[in-house]
């Protein structure tokens, strides 16, 4: 056997290249069969009517054919013919790859709750082979579970990813990635998430800055929730009691002027949309007011002032100890 | 000159023999599928056999099939057609053709 | 049994065009081939593939090409163009070859 030929794989719409080899060529015919083992090339002859077969080389050892615009129907072998006695027959096999034409991602929701199992399918419609389909969460790869269905020698792959939403993944994107032999590159399509969830609630304390509450101060406390959709509803209330009579209520904000030891208690920040609702409660300490010490005399000062400093530190200290984590949010 | 001369017909009873031949020249004739085709009197051009340039394949019409071979030597140039079994419907003018799939070069044919 | 039809005699006035054709299912695949041949003559080929002459034949022979029908055209048709034209090709196999019974033209 002396005449040689090699396997051709192209992607659709390409050109492929039909080779026939001889070696220790006597002259002999070449002849190109199509996979109906119809001639295409008879020497450097074109017998048949597909003008996408010319001619790229014709010589005692070698016929080379090109076939552009390849589609899925010219896949099969071809056989090179050479008139020896006996004759000799060998054959190359066109595999034609045809990417996905269409790459769909359909969420089930468009939009889900936190806590909700929702289903994302892609589908990749008619390629050759089988496309994978690869699912990410933001960068995070998940896993999928993909059919294939089969159809005149293309498949359809569908993947389903089960998908449990938190609200960390609200604006994330969920993406369908394709590895198919005939592309290049990264073909993707993609979603973004749109999760629902109940409100985070968060108390700031705004005045007084230092953190330290003291008899006839003020009190500003601001109601931070975020929630999607946003809170429709935020409220102030005291836990067990009675709201002070002094106490002053504007959307977030709850004011209390010239604090007293009978505003102590818990001050709740309730917050609501569709979801559902969250608090954070706020446990008020009013301290007495500061000690107004008289200056002290000559011979006493070192000792006075350290001792009068030691003691503002131990007591500004304890307060700040006591006072230091009041909010507790649910 | 290109040019084929074909020889050997001639008045047969049905039943009986006859060998045709065909002389090449002009040509390297080793390196050409070499075919006969028919014309009975009157009527159209029917092929009859075909061999391929090294005489490893053949092929036949229907209506020979089994009675004619065809065969070369391509060291004498020369391509011949053995018919036995001759019938009435045979008889017609030979003509060898040179083939590169069409027929290029005919001969004047023998009867 | 495979076949190729032509019309059996067609005829043309002097200088016109005239078109001869042959049907076929293997003319869906394969090129047809056209002979002429004139009374006690041998067979010449004068169309081939897509529509190519062989050196010595007019360029008033034309050929095409359309679904299972192959045509040969004379545009300007001569009195020496009057002869007997066979089509020719060969079964999907590419083995078997077969003739067109053959189209009488007479320049009138």
């Known amino acids: 056997q002396n005449l040689f030929t090699k396997d051709v794989t192209v992607i659709e719409g390409e050109v492929a290249t039909i080779s026939c080899q001889v070696n220790k060529s006597d002259d002999s015919v070449i002849q190109l069969l199509n996979p109906n083992r119809q001639t295409i090339y008879f020497r450097d002859f074109r017998p048949l009517k597909d003008s996408r077969f010319q001619l790229l080389n014709f010589s005692s050892s070698e016929l080379k054919v090109s076939l552009t615009n390849v589609s899925i129907s010219d896949e099969g072998r071809y056989f090179c013919q050479l008139y020896t006695d006996p004759p000799q027959e060998s054959y190359t096999t066109i595999t034609v790859l045809v990417p996905p034409r269409n790459l769909m991602i359909d969420i089930q929701k468009d939009t889900a709750v936190e806590g909700e199992e929702i289903e994302v399918n892609c589908t990749a419609m008619a390629s050759k082979p089988a496309t994978t389909i690869r699912w990410f969460k933001g960068n995070t790869e998940l896993k999928g579970k993909s059919e294939v269905e089969e159809w005149s020698d293309m498949y359809t792959v569908t993947s389903q990813l089960m998908l449990k939403v938190h609200k960390e993944d609200d604006g994330v994107p969920v993406i369908c990635q394709v590895e198919h032999p005939a592309v290049t590159g990264n073909l993707q399509t993609q979603r973004y998430l749109e999760v629902q969830y109940k409100p985070q609630v968060h108390i700031q304390m705004t005045y007084p800055l230092q953190g330290l509450t003291r008899e006839g101060d003020a009190l500003e406390l601001t109601c931070e929730a975020i929630g999607k959709p946003q809170p429709v509803m935020v409220t102030w209330v005291r836990v067990d009691d009675e709201m002070p009579q002094h106490a002053v209520l504007s959307g977030p904000n709850l004011f209390i002027n010239n604090l007293n030891k009978t505003d102590n208690g818990t001050y709740r920040c309730e917050a609501s949309n569709i979801v559902g609702k969250a608090h954070s409660d706020y446990m008020l300490y009013v301290y007495d007011p500061p000690t107004t010490i008289p200056p002290p005399t000559t011979t006493t000062t070192t000792t006075t002032t350290t001792t009068t400093t030691i003691l503002t530190i131990i007591t500004d200290s304890r307060a700040g100890e006591e006072g230091s984590i009041r909010a507790v949010d649910h | 000159e290109v040019q084929l001369l074909e020889s050997g017909g001639g008045l047969v009873q049905p039943g009986g023999s006859l060998r045709l031949s065909c002389a090449a020249s002009?040509?390297?004739?080793?390196?050409?599928?070499m075919s006969w085709v028919r014309q009975a009197p009157g009527k159209g051009l029917e092929w009859v056999s075909s061999?391929?340039?090294?005489?490893?394949?053949?092929s036949y019409a229907d209506s020979v099939k089994g009675r004619f071979t065809i065969s070369r030597d391509n060291s004498k140039n020369t391509l011949y057609l053995q018919m036995n079994s001759l019938r009435a419907e045979d008889t017609a003018v030979y003509y060898c053709?040179?083939?590169?799939?069409?027929?290029?070069?005919w001969g004047r044919g023998t009867l | 049994q495979y076949e190729l039809t032509q019309d059996p005699a067609v005829s043309v006035a002097l200088g016109q065009t005239v078109r001869i054709t042959c049907q076929g299912h293997?003319?869906?695949?394969?090129?047809a081939t056209w002979y002429q041949q004139k009374p006690g003559q041998a067979p010449v080929l004068v169309m081939y593939?897509?529509?190519n002459r062989p050196s010595g034949i007019p360029d008033r022979f034309s050929g095409s090409s359309s679904g299972n029908t192959a045509s040969l055209t004379i545009t300007g048709a001569q009195a020496e163009d009057e002869a007997d034209y066979y089509c020719?090709?060969?079964?999907?196999?590419?083995?078997?070859?077969?003739f067109g019974g053959g189209t009488n033209l007479t320049v009138l």
């Open positions: 053709a040179k083939e590169s799939w069409y027929f290029d070069l």
């Open positions: 061999i391929w340039s090294s005489g490893g394949k053949t």
């Open positions: 293997s003319l869906r695949s394969y090129y």
């Open positions: 020719n090709s060969r079964d999907n196999s590419g083995n078997h070859l077969v």
């Open positions: 593939g897509e529509n």
């Open positions: 002009g040509f390297t004739f080793s390196m050409y599928t």
